[in-house]
């Protein structure tokens, strides 16, 4: 049950990213750290970098509400038990500032890519009976 809910939440984050991609022109065109080709065991660290990034609505009015709600939902913190190997490897993972900075469109695309990778890994670990999530 908990594992299923975890997967639903991760997929939900992809849906939120997809919704925000519809509004890239309404986001502040700021360059944000956007992890790519994240090394194994640093996925949760990179995930945390995406969540910390200051993605913001440009307050143009029309879609401000849905953008702000979506950004806030993107920052929902998973329980630490879901961080898998994060604790063990945190010290060896790149800092958020070390990742290449990208505008909102590419930032969201890279976030989606990471989420997809994490979902794939999660499913694989379940298939192979691993404890990691």
């Amino acid at each position: 049950q908990g594992q299923d809910r975890h997967m639903i939440r991760m997929r939900q984050l992809i849906d939120i990213v997809d919704q925000l991609k519809n509004y890239v022109n309404d986001l502040v065109p700021e360059f944000l750290p956007a992890p790519e080709d994240v090394e194994t065991n640093c996925e949760w660290s990179a995930f945390s970098c995406f969540q910390k990034a200051q993605l913001k609505s440009a307050n143009t009015g029309n879609n401000e509400r849905i953008i702000n709600v979506s950004i806030k939902k993107l920052k929902r913190k998973p329980p630490s038990t879901n961080a898998g190997r994060r604790q063990k490897h945190r010290l060896t993972c790149p800092s958020c500032d070390s990742y290449e900075k990208k505008p909102p469109k590419e930032f969201l695309e890279r976030f989606k890519s990471l989420l997809q990778k994490m979902i794939h890994q999660h499913l694989s670990s379940r298939t192979h009976g691993s404890e990691d999530s």
């Epitope: 809910r5 975890h6 939900q12 849906d15 849905i66 939902k73 929902r76």
Partner: antibody, heavy 126, light 106 residues
Framework: QVQLVESGGGVVQPGRSLRLSCAAS????????MHWVRQAPGKGLEWVAF????????YYADSVKGRFTISRDNSKNTLYLQMNSLRAEDTAVYYC???????????????????WGQGTTVTVSS | EIVLTQSPGTLSLSPGERATLSCRAS???????LAWYQQKPGQAPRLLIY???TRATGIPDRFSGSGSGTDFTLTISRLEPEDFAVYYC???????FGQGTKVEIK
């Protein structure tokens, strides 16, 4: 069982104020965002306001912005709608509704309003 | 702000028939953000479908939702007497409702 009960409706003159309450029971109120939705006589549904589960963010429909204030008291499991400078066009049945997306990672995940109260009627008339 | 346009305004059908309700958005909506509600006279609305196609708890399987982008559909495969009501689509996050489709007995 999961329940929302609104109160505080009534007849009020234009320009006056009214405060609606919504008592929640049967669920962890502090884990859910909450909405007010209204329905004028013979009309469709109109979203009015939303408050985040912890009260940290509030959103309003343009038609009520600056006049209505949504708030909550998680210790009392109660949602409020303070309505000031009331107008004839505010006449409606007011519903409180639970947002189906829980703040809990393992909680409910519905992007919709999954629990509704029975509604309380507000009539603005001189 | 997004506008949701429902059609038809009224659908006159007989019990046992299939009902197809449309909801068109003025800009693209992620499927996760589209919900459908049912409202009967004198009652509060009830969540039917969330995520464009997932039935809410306790909703019979004769109700189904589909669509993506700007076009969404609610289908009632065989109308039961209790299904005659008004149906609303909604975009989550902006919480905008469509104007509603009334399904009435022919």
């Amino acid at each position: 069982q999961v329940q929302l009960v609104e109160s505080g409706g009534g007849v009020v003159q234009p320009g006056r104020s009214l405060r609606l309450s919504c008592a929640a029971s049967g669920f962890t109120f502090s884990s859910y965002g909450m909405h007010w939705v209204r329905q004028a006589p013979g009309k469709g549904l109109e979203w009015v306001a939303f408050i985040w589960y912890d009260g940290s963010d509030k959103y309003y429909a343009d038609s009520v912005k600056g006049r209505f204030t949504i708030s909550r008291d998680n210790s009392k499991n109660t949602l409020y709608l303070q309505m000031n400078s009331l107008r004839a066009e505010d006449t409606a049945v007011y519903y409180c509704a639970r947002d189906g997306d829980s703040s809990d990672w393992y909680g409910d995940y519905y992007f919709g309003m999954d629990v509704w109260g029975q509604g309380t009627t507000v009539t603005v008339s001189s | 702000e997004i506008v949701l346009t429902q059609s038809p305004g009224t659908l006159s059908l007989s019990p046992g028939e299939r009902a197809t309700l449309s909801c068109r958005a003025s800009q693209s909506v992620s499927s996760s953000y589209l919900a459908w509600y049912q409202q009967k006279p004198g009652q509060a609305p009830r969540l039917l479908i969330y995520g464009a196609s997932t039935r809410a708890t306790g909703i019979p399987d004769r109700f189904s939702g589909s669509g993506s982008g700007t076009d969404f559909t609610l289908t009632i495969s065989r109308l039961e007497p209790e299904d005659f009501a008004v149906y609303y689509c909604q975009q989550y996050g902006s919480w905008t409702f469509g104007q509603g489709t009334k399904v009435e007995i022919k």
